[in-house]
């Protein structure tokens, strides 16, 4: 009797188990009692990345330079184009449909991880003993100056935004 379920890489239609089209090809006609599934390769600007029964291939993604995008990896008949962002920008989502400038870490914060084309700058608060007095997308928190190594004393304590101020030691009268 006609099957109710089919093997892997097959699909059920009109009581027939038909072969799916391989990645890079689209369905032209279903199999019949007397014929195989017929598939055709996707055109140059299209792709299908799975075993499928799609009658249309998907268009490759367009990396729009007006949105700050550029091609990281050209698409094939089996893979989509991968976009990334131009220098100084990163993707707004995993699918990378547009780009925004990397954020800078404000004073009191340093760069934990420099931004890439697909990820934003990661900032971290400067811990005790470190500071950042600039807004930057590259600079880490810097350690306070060690007055002792210069035979100086701390005249003004450091904060997460400022370095310590060193001064000469008081002379005994």
């Amino acid at each position: 009797e006609p099957p109710t379920a089919c093997r892997e890489k097959q699909y059920l239609i009109n009581s027939q188990c038909c072969s799916l089209c391989q990645p890079g090809q689209k369905l032209v006609s279903d199999c019949t009692e007397f014929t195989e599934t017929e598939c055709l390769p996707c055109s140059e600007s299209e792709f299908l990345d799975t075993w499928n029964r799609e009658t249309r291939c998907h268009q490759h993604k367009y990396c729009d330079p007006n949105l700050g995008l550029q091609v990281q990896q050209k698409g094939t008949s089996e893979t989509d184009t991968i976009c990334t962002c131009e220098e100084g920008l990163h993707c707004t989502s995993e699918s990378c449909e547009s780009c925004v400038p990397h954020r800078s870490c404000l004073p009191g914060f340093g760069v934990k991880q420099i931004a890439t084309g697909v990820s934003d700058t990661i900032c971290e608060p400067c811990p005790v003993g470190f500071f950042s007095n600039v807004s930057s997308a590259f600079e880490k928190c810097r350690p306070w100056t060690s007055c002792e190594t210069k035979d100086l004393v701390v005249q003004q304590a450091g904060t997460n935004k400022t370095d310590v101020v060193c001064g000469p030691q008081d002379r005994q009268r």
């Epitope: 072969s19 032209v28 006609s29 279903d30 019949t32 009692e33 007397f34 014929t35 195989e36």
Partner: antibody
Framework: QVQLQESGPGLVKPSETLSLTCTVS?????????WNWIRQPPGKGLEWMGY???????NYNPSLKNRITISRDTSKNQFSLKLSSVTAADTAVYYC?????WGQGTLVTVSS | DAVMTQSPLSLPVTLGEPASISCRSS???????????LNWFQQKPGQSPRLLIY???NRFSGVPDRFSGSGSGTDFTLKISRVEAEDVGVYYC?????????FGQGTKLEIK
Amino acid sequence: QVQLQESGPGLVKPSETLSLTCTVSGYSITSNYYWNWIRQPPGKGLEWMGYIRYDGSNNYNPSLKNRITISRDTSKNQFSLKLSSVTAADTAVYYCARLDYWGQGTLVTVSS
Amino acid sequence: DAVMTQSPLSLPVTLGEPASISCRSSQSLENTNGNTFLNWFQQKPGQSPRLLIYRVSNRFSGVPDRFSGSGSGTDFTLKISRVEAEDVGVYYCLQVTHVPFTFGQGTKLEIK
């Protein structure tokens, strides 16, 4: 329900061209399947002559050399057989078929 | 061409008894995808052929389950588990893996 119906002259003179039409109802000939012509000489077995596919492309039995043409009229959902330079050996019942569904057949006699 | 050879050509059977028809091909009917397009047809006197079995072993819609098909490669069999009076006719195998499609010569089943 898919139905096929052959039509055409039952008598053809030797050396002339045999022409038959198959009208299909219940299914579009452009949707899928191969649409075949098969013949059966009186008291003999079946012989596949050729087909026209849903996309309009053809395949013919090499035994019929260059005598056979299968065409279609999609507006009427029909496909047709032309067999040129016929002889008495082409006398047969001619069937159009999708293979799972067949016409009732039409007897064509080649005689002067 | 794939030459299809059926045996026996004549098969007298007692009602209620089983019957078996063999069909051998001159070349393998398994295609590159591992599918085999071997079909069985029944033709009763004065009627068009009727599809019984497709792709070696699949019964076509409405065909009684006393009919079964088996085989692979080049050797195929049609079995009738218990012959009934209405099964009288000629049985043909047809391969549609290779072009040209080719029929066996036919096996005439009759009641003893």
